[in-house]
Interface confidence: low
């Protein structure tokens, strides 16, 4: 399918690339003492970057420090020191730079204030950081200011006194709309959801919190839940974990109408030491992790139906260390339906798994062509690729980056990995897939930092090394051939690659510092690849590609979730610019339905290796512990429900008698009197 990757050999060397890149390499030296640098992009396609450098001496008595603020409006080629715009104030790095949604051009920086002050201080900009306004707050912020996704003038923040503060005019004036607030989040349509403690404190009242909602920025409120442990938003779903009456367990409840009505999710309840985690959610469905009892480090992934109520077991022994801990769960954004994660085997080895159908089936990653199985493999000819992600990084393995994919670089996935029966602790190599994870090839030897530019037209990499570096590698053919470019004669201690989010840019910034004796200087080099890709791509540069194609002879080839998609993709041999305005061209076509397009509805399950749903024997003739919309009602089903997001039409339609599932409703979540009602079977 493809040859082994090469660096400067067996590959056509791009003509004059050194001269072209040298002319487009811009150095900026930051003349300050800072210990840390944070970088934020302001807006989309604006070229505006804000860089905040901070230096802090963490003294118990007085913490003193200095911040400098720099601004670029040409994608990092030149920076201007704009510290004077924030009155040379020390900025609190733990709050970061709060950048407004979309292209609002809004920025909020939170300043350090002296101990006795009445409230905090922010600097606000609404013109892409050209100007800042200093505003003194009537409270000390506990969290970063949160913008409403619908209206960037609306802000919310929690204070150190647990007050919920709201601004309707981009932080100019603030109003405390509620006290004793533990957690607050923006929902759709400028709704604010928040939990409050009733008696003692957020920690003491965990499991006895109330969930409130305001739809008018704090004029009126509605209590939408009691006995709350925590809540979360995912896609169009609002989730709450609620304490049970009888014991210390809790259950997930789901609402799709902003908390007016709730249904108990058909998921196992969890005890005090366990947790639920929303791994991914979209408008159609949710991936939910449910922790196993005990300190096992694993749990089970469940996938939801379109209501977020009925869940199918998706993957056992899913690696997830602790609450807020590490999981390798990764959404491969370059191909619909693809996710990669890790499982923990009985022997405590970690293995990578991939699903191409949104969690319906999981399998091992195919062994890359021409690769040898490592020492972890029992059979030296049969093994698979194992991907390093968050867990490996947390374990300080030599893995500088998590897997990378971009929606507009169709099919491309880049990740560190090893080839064997399980993840290896040996130094990993970098692998690439150009078909969304179906097949893989070794891309680079040893660990690297990598990024995608020009919607996949260029891949850039830098070797991960303890020594100073001065070489950047790049590929114009999806990682098959690599060229090396010396971007500076004075090697730097590399700290990061920065390119504009969205992978549409052709600029890459290499950040690091130089040290002479032990004086440090931050420096950035921005390389513009526009002259490497010197012409715009034309029609002939693209070729059609059927996603998820595994069996070209089959009429259902490429069908995932009821439809197939054909993409126009750049030929590997074409060296041209997709350009900033590139839109992924795809042609969807609907597939006929089969049983694979349906999940088993409540009270039904699929026996292993079977395609039909059968009634769960333990539920036959029993009252079901199931609560739909928080009130007693008849639940009718034929045992099947279409998988969320599935678009199949015609073909097989599972027809069978409609059953009436009588049940009791055991949740007293919202209205204890109504919710405790029972029906007798």
């Amino acid at each position: 399918r493809r040859g082994a990757p090469a660096e400067d050999q067996d590959c056509g060397r791009l003509p004059d690339f050194i001269a072209k890149l040298t002319n487009n390499t811009h150095q900026h030296v930051f003349d300050d003492l800072s210990g840390s640098v944070s970088l934020s992009w302001v807006g989309d396609s604006t070229g505006v970057i804000l860089v905040l450098t901070t230096f802090q001496v963490p003294l118990v008595i007085v913490s003193f420090g200095q911040s400098k603020l720099y601004r670029s409006e040409d994608y990092g080629k030149n920076f201007k020191d704009i510290t004077n715009l924030i009155n040379n104030t020390f900025i609190r790095t733990e709050f970061g730079m709060a950048i407004g949604p979309e292209n609002s051009g809004k920025v909020i920086l939170t300043a350090e204030v002296s101990g006795g002050s009445r409230g905090g201080r922010v600097f606000r900009s609404s013109d892409f950081a050209k100007n800042f306004v200093q505003t003194d707050l009537p409270f000390h912020p506990l969290t970063q200011m949160m913008y409403s996704p619908q209206n960037s003038d609306y802000l919310l923040a929690l204070s150190t006194e647990n007050g919920l503060w709201v601004s309707k005019n981009f932080g100019e004036k603030w109003e405390e709309i509620h006290k004793a607030v533990c957690l607050a989040k923006w929902g759709p349509n400028n709704i604010i959801f928040f939990t409050t403690h009733v008696n003692g404190s957020c920690k003491a009242d965990l499991g006895a919190l109330e969930l409130w909602r305001t739809s008018d920025l704090g004029k009126t409120f509605k209590t939408i839940g009691v006995k709350i442990y925590s809540f979360g938003l995912g896609g169009r779903f609002l989730f709450a974990s609620v304490m049970a009456d009888k014991d210390t367990t809790r259950r997930i409840h789901v609402s799709t109408d902003q908390g007016d009505t709730w249904s108990m999710a058909q998921l196992p309840s969890v005890g005090q030491e366990q947790f639920y985690s929303i791994l991914a959610a979209n408008e159609d469905m949710v991936f939910m992790h449910v922790d196993e009892p005990g300190d096992t480090g694993f749990g089970t992934i469940f996938t939801s139906d379109d209501r977020g109520i009925v869940y199918s077991k998706s993957l056992d022994r899913h690696l997830y260390t602790t609450t807020g801990g590490e999981t390798d769960f990764t959404n491969v954004t370059s191909l619909r339906g693809v996710y990669i994660t890790s499982t923990l085997s009985e022997d405590n080895s970690i293995q990578s798994m991939i699903t191409f159908d949104q969690g319906g089936r999981w399998e091992h990653l195919r062994k890359p062509e021409n690769s040898k199985c490592d020492a972890t493999a029992k059979n030296k000819n049969e093994c698979s690729l194992h991907i390093h992600a968050s867990y490996s990084i947390s374990q300080k393995l030599n893995v500088p980056m998590a897997p990378l994919s971009e929606p507009n670089a169709v099919g491309i996935v880049i990740a560190h990995g090893s080839v064997g029966d399980a993840i290896s602790v040996m130094v990993p190599d970098v692998y690439i897939s150009d078909d969304g994870g179906y097949s893989w090839a070794k891309m680079l030897e040893g660990p690297h930092y990598y990024t995608i530019l020009d919607s996949g037209g260029i891949i850039v990499a830098i070797e991960h090394s303890n020594r100073p570096i001065n070489v950047i590698k790049f590929s114009t053919d999806e990682g098959q051939c690599w060229q090396s470019y010396v971007f500076t004669q004075e090697p730097i201690y590399f700290t990061g690659l920065a390119s504009e989010p969205g992978a549409r840019s052709m600029n890459i910034s290499i950040w690091g510092f130089t040290e002479s004796f032990i004086t440090r200087q931050w420096v950035s080099y921005t390389v513009d690849f526009k002259d490497i890709l010197e012409r715009n791509c034309e029609e002939d540069d693209y070729t059609t590609w059927l996603a998820h194609s595994t069996d070209p002879g089959d009429y259902k080839d490429g069908c995932i979730l009821g439809y197939k998609e054909q993409f126009l993709r750049l030929r590997k041999s074409s060296v041209c610019q997709n350009g900033r305005d590139y839109v992924v061209a795809k042609q969807p076509s609907v597939c006929p339905c089969s049983l694979e397009d349906f999940l088993c509805d409540f009270g039904y399950f699929r026996p292993e290796n079977a395609s039909e749903c059968v009634e769960q024997p333990e539920l036959k003739g029993h009252e079901l512990e199931f609560c739909l919309y928080g009130k007693e009602e008849h639940l009718t089903t034929n045992g099947y429900r279409k998988i969320p997001g599935d678009k199949c039409q015609g073909g097989m339609n599972p027809a069978r008698e409609v059953k009436d599932l009588k049940k009791k409703c055991t949740s007293n979540f919202l209205n204890p009197t109504k919710q405790n009602s029972k029906s007798n079977s």
């Epitope: 003492l33 944070s38 003294l59 200095q66 032990i518």
Partner: antibody, heavy 129, light 107 residues
Framework: QVQLVQSGAEVKKPGASVKVSCKAS????????MSWVRQAPGQGLEWMGI????????SYAQKFQGRVTMTRDTSTSTVYMELSSLRSEDTAVYYC??????????????????????WGQGTTVTVSS | EIVMTQSPATLSVSPGERATLSCRAS??????LAWYQQKPGQAPRLLIY???TRATGIPARFSGSGSGTEFTLTISSLQSEDFAVYYC?????????FGGGTKVEIK
């Protein structure tokens, strides 16, 4: 080469003030912080405080708070340490030392201390009535 | 403040022998620790920074180890010029603090 040259010995009466200077050369003065450390006769080292030559911001050990003032003059690449309300127990050798003060290594998450790498020769301050 | 405790207060060693000096912090200082050597009438001299990295010009016989709360300075084979007082210093949390020192004397 990099060096810090301090002012000469001082003899002061109790209740008086002393101002010790420390002139830096051989490196960019504003690129590094400066700490002051003292050592009483036969005793160990005691950190007094630190100054940032860029903005002149300071932080002092609680023990010296209210009595010590650290300043700098960027035009002459000199830092000063003034100690007021002197008492006999302030008799010591006072050192200035170039101090990187926890500059992060590769990125904001990791902190790394490089040590006070260059010291002045010391200034003896004797407080006696 | 973080208290740094050095032991022993005095270490008697013959030239050519190995010397092991200990430094303990009252709470974790990560690897933000330095070791200094001071000879009578002289300013301190930086030996080790970052708990284990030798400063420029420091001979290889000096080595540092440890992180968190327990640190060690080892002089593999004592030379006559190594007899001096050695101090550890933390820079994890202000105020910076020094240990009381260990005097390495000729046995």
């Amino acid at each position: 080469q990099v060096q810090l040259v301090q002012s000469g010995a001082e003899v002061k009466k109790p209740g008086a003030s002393v101002k010790v200077s420390c002139k830096a050369s051989g490196y960019t003065f504003t690129s590094r912080y400066m700490s002051w450390v003292r050592q009483a006769p036969g005793q160990g080292l005691e950190w007094m405080g630190i100054i940032n030559p860029v903005g002149g911001s300071t932080s002092y050990a609680q023990k010296f708070q209210g009595r010590v003032t650290m300043t700098r003059d960027t035009s002459t690449s000199t830092v000063y340490m003034e100690l007021s309300s002197l008492r006999s127990e302030d008799t010591a050798v006072y050192y200035c030392a170039r101090d990187p003060s926890g500059i992060a290594a590769a990125g904001p998450a990791s902190r790394y201390y490089y040590g006070m790498d260059v010291w002045g020769q010391g200034t003896t301050v004797t407080v006696s009535s | 403040e973080i208290v740094m405790t050095q032991s022993p207060a005095t270490l008697s060693v013959s030239p050519g022998e190995r010397a092991t000096l200990s430094c303990r912090a009252s709470q974790s200082v990560s690897s933000n620790l330095a070791w200094y050597q001071q000879k009578p009438g002289q300013a301190p001299r930086l030996l080790i920074y970052g708990a284990s990295t030798r400063a420029t010009g420091i001979p290889a016989r000096f080595s540092g180890s440890g992180s968190g709360t327990e640190f060690t300075l080892t002089i593999s084979s004592l030379q006559s010029e190594d007899f001096a007082v050695y101090y550890c210093q933390q820079a994890r949390l202000g105020p910076w603090t020094f240990g009381g020192g260990t005097k390495v004397e000729i046995k």
